[in-house]
């Protein structure tokens, strides 16, 4: 039989979702107006194109990414895309409100709309780690939370770090995973006996998970690429991002049957690994020489993936309550990490390069800025997981967990779905 | 070929009124390069204006013209536009373009540098 | 970042080693340029990136420094030198410039 959205739900999500909506609307209409001078149109079709494949990476690829499991793929999809849609207006918001407010009215650009799709995609990574524990209501709080904090963390770090949007955004890999992990912490864990089989995957939705990392695969150079300066510096990124995330579909395959005492490949981990050397190139995309490098940084990316799709599912599971099958959090958390380590490599290449004494003091930033992004996430993350905890929210019980029919109307009610 | 920048649309204005200037290039595609407004009051140093990403994305102002001044780019035409509106007393000042030349000067970073320049056009504010 | 340069002006002769400090309020790397400007003409750009001499600028100019503190060095003043010299921040947007050095004859 249908389990019913609860009745409590039922009052709560339209009127919070809708007032939330409207108190939106009435945002946009006080404090934003569109940028009045675009001469050049052809720019503008070109700008926005980024844009577009920002937006495809997070509502096919991540959407579809995180919907693997046995009964719950139809609300990962759309959830994922109900917040992208809610975050990408908050983020554009907040983001006017924290740069651009002082001057009168937040001025709306593509730049901003491109902005606040990648400040939405740090939740949507986030969120793997929850997916299936959450109703709509608790989602809504963690957009808001989130993306309220890698906003003021952004505008922390560019105001004491003065660094420029790429290498900003590009801590949105370690925050999001960080983030989402403090979440799952904090919700509740154990899976009652008999509902194991729902946190499972199944073939047809292992299917259209495999078509989200084919999306994201396909447009990740475009991800890393989207807030560089200058077209040289934007046609490297593309490059050496390209590289990486081939050489890491490579190893992620072989990898995955070399993992396998039957030398099988794991849907699971060829999911995740494919996109490793696209986070482990991230943040130093633009400034890696020659292709070698960054296909050597897809190899390393792709064997720490694969590794940790082996051997830490188990400790996640245990600790964090997280499925075998949402090993983006950990993943991103250590390949954003390569990525870190790798940019601070560079910056000591530089300075010895350069014999002076300032050495020292350029590493230190760089993990100033680095911790700062992890303790944020932490602190932010444990705070929306007290948040979840909250009885108004209604979550899930845990019987109830990884199952569409909570949310859905299925029309024959097919109980393998 | 040479490279070249041209500034036009100078003059007097009152204040609270509008100007609007013009820098095309020449000698080079414009929509390879990201570009800025600096400006010099009378006697004064330099300060920098306004700058505008190579594919008009993103725009940043100095603080003293935000939301009062618009940085734009017509890369077809391959010229760079600056729109001044509610101008004021202390915005006279000879106002040039400059190109924004990005090189690989580290291993962890690209540095903007102004590598070329136009000869500037004066802006007079006075009632 | 604020920019502070020193001197402000200063006379010098021909033949004369010219050194011009420029400071910046908070550490920018090598992310510093100098930029030579003439009366009534635009700015030229001499230096860029602390040290690296930009191409068709004679190697008597040369630059050094990082972190908070840089220097422009003429080895051997020319007359076509006397002008005023600026140095310029690429750091972070704004992109600050100093309040500029004269160079005048003595």
């Known amino acids: 039989m249908s389990s019913k959205y609860p009745r409590s739900v039922r009052r709560c999500l339209p009127l919070w979702a809708l007032t939330l909506e409207a108190a939106l609307i009435l945002l946009f209409y006080f404090f934003t107006h569109y940028d009045a001078s675009l001469e050049d149109q052809k720019g503008l079709v070109a700008s926005y194109q980024v844009g577009q494949d920002l937006t495809v990476m997070a509502a096919i690829g991540l959407g579809f990414l995180t919907s693997s499991f046995r009964r719950h793929s139809w609300s990962s999809v759309a959830f994922n895309l109900f917040m992208l849609a809610l975050g990408v207006q908050w983020a554009i918001l907040l983001d006017g409100f924290l740069s651009q407010f002082p001057s009168g009215k937040v001025v709306i650009t593509l730049f901003s709309i491109r902005l606040a799709t990648m400040s939405a995609l740090s939740v949507l990574i986030s969120v793997d780690a929850v997916l299936g524990k959450v109703n709509l209501a608790q989602l809504v709080v963690m957009v808001l939370v989130e993306v309220t904090a890698l906003g003021n963390l952004r505008m922390v770090i560019s105001n004491i770090f003065n660094t420029d949007y790429h290498m900003n955004m590009m801590h949105i890999y370690v925050f999001a995973a960080y983030f989402g992990l403090s979440v799952a912490w904090c919700l509740p864990k154990p899976l009652p006996e008999g509902t194991e089989d729902k946190d499972q995957t199944a073939t047809i939705p292992s299917l259209s998970a495999m078509l989200g990392a084919l999306f994201l695969w396909m447009f990740w150079p475009s991800f890393n690429s989207a807030l560089l300066r200058s077209p040289i510096e934007r046609k490297n990124a593309v490059f050496n991002t390209y590289y990486a995330v081939a050489v890491s579909v490579v190893t992620a395959i072989s990898g995955s049957s070399l993992a396998h005492p039957q030398g099988k490949i794991s849907k699971t981990y060829v999911h995740s690994a494919v996109l490793a050397g696209g986070v482990a190139v991230g943040t130093s995309c633009h400034l890696i020489p020659s292709p070698w490098l960054a296909m050597v940084l897809g190899l390393v990316a792709g064997l720490i993936s694969v590794g940790g799709a082996k051997y830490l599912p188990g400790c996640c599971n245990r600790v964090l309550g997280i499925p075998h099958s949402s090993i983006m959090g950990y993943n991103f958390s250590l390949l954003g990490l390569l990525g870190e380590i790798i940019y601070i490599v560079l910056l000591v290449l530089d300075t010895v390069g350069a014999g002076n004494g300032m050495i020292g003091f350029q590493v230190l930033l760089s993990i100033g800025e680095l911790s700062l992004a992890i303790v944020i996430a932490l602190m932010s993350g444990l705070l929306t997981g007290l948040l979840l905890n909250l009885k108004i929210w209604k979550a899930p019980h845990e019987a109830k967990y990884f199952d569409d029919q909570v949310f859905w109307k299925f029309p024959h009610l097919a109980v393998g779905f | 070929e040479v490279q070249l920048l041209e500034e036009s649309g100078g003059g007097v204005a009152q204040p609270g009124r509008s100007l609007r200037l013009s820098c095309v290039a020449s000698?080079?595609?414009?929509?390879?390069?990201?570009m800025h407004w600096v400006r010099q009051a009378p006697g004064k140093g330099l300060e920098w204006v306004a700058d505008i990403w190579f594919d008009g994305s993103n725009k940043d102002y100095a603080d003293s013209v935000k939301g009062r001044f618009t940085i734009s780019r017509d890369n077809s035409k391959n010229t760079l536009y600056l729109q001044m509106n509610s101008l004021r007393a202390e915005d006279t000042a000879v106002y040039y373009c400059?190109?924004?030349?990005?090189?690989?000067?580290?291993?962890?970073?690209?540095?903007?540098?102004?590598?070329?320049w136009g000869q500037g056009t004066t802006v007079s504010v006075s009632s | 970042a604020e920019l502070t340069q020193s001197p402000s002006s200063l006379s010098a002769s021909v033949a004369d080693r010219v050194t011009i400090t420029c400071r910046t309020s908070r550490n920018i790397n090598r992310y510093l340029n100098w930029y030579q400007q003439k009366p009534g003409k635009a700015p030229k750009l001499l230096i860029y990136?602390?040290?690296s001499l930009q191409s068709g600028v004679p190697s008597r100019f040369s630059g050094s420094g990082s972190g908070t503190d840089f220097t422009l060095t003429i080895t051997s003043l020319q007359p076509e030198d006397f002008a005023t010299y600026y140095c310029?921040?690429?750091?972070?947007?704004?992109?600050?410039f100093g309040p500029g050095t004269k160079v005048d004859l003595k």
């Open positions: 310029q921040q690429s750091y972070s947007t704004p992109f600050t």
């Open positions: 000698g080079f595609s414009l929509r390879s390069y990201g």
């Open positions: 990136a602390a040290s």
């Open positions: 400059a190109r924004d030349w990005r090189v690989r000067a580290f291993s962890s970073g690209w540095l903007s540098a102004f590598d070329i």
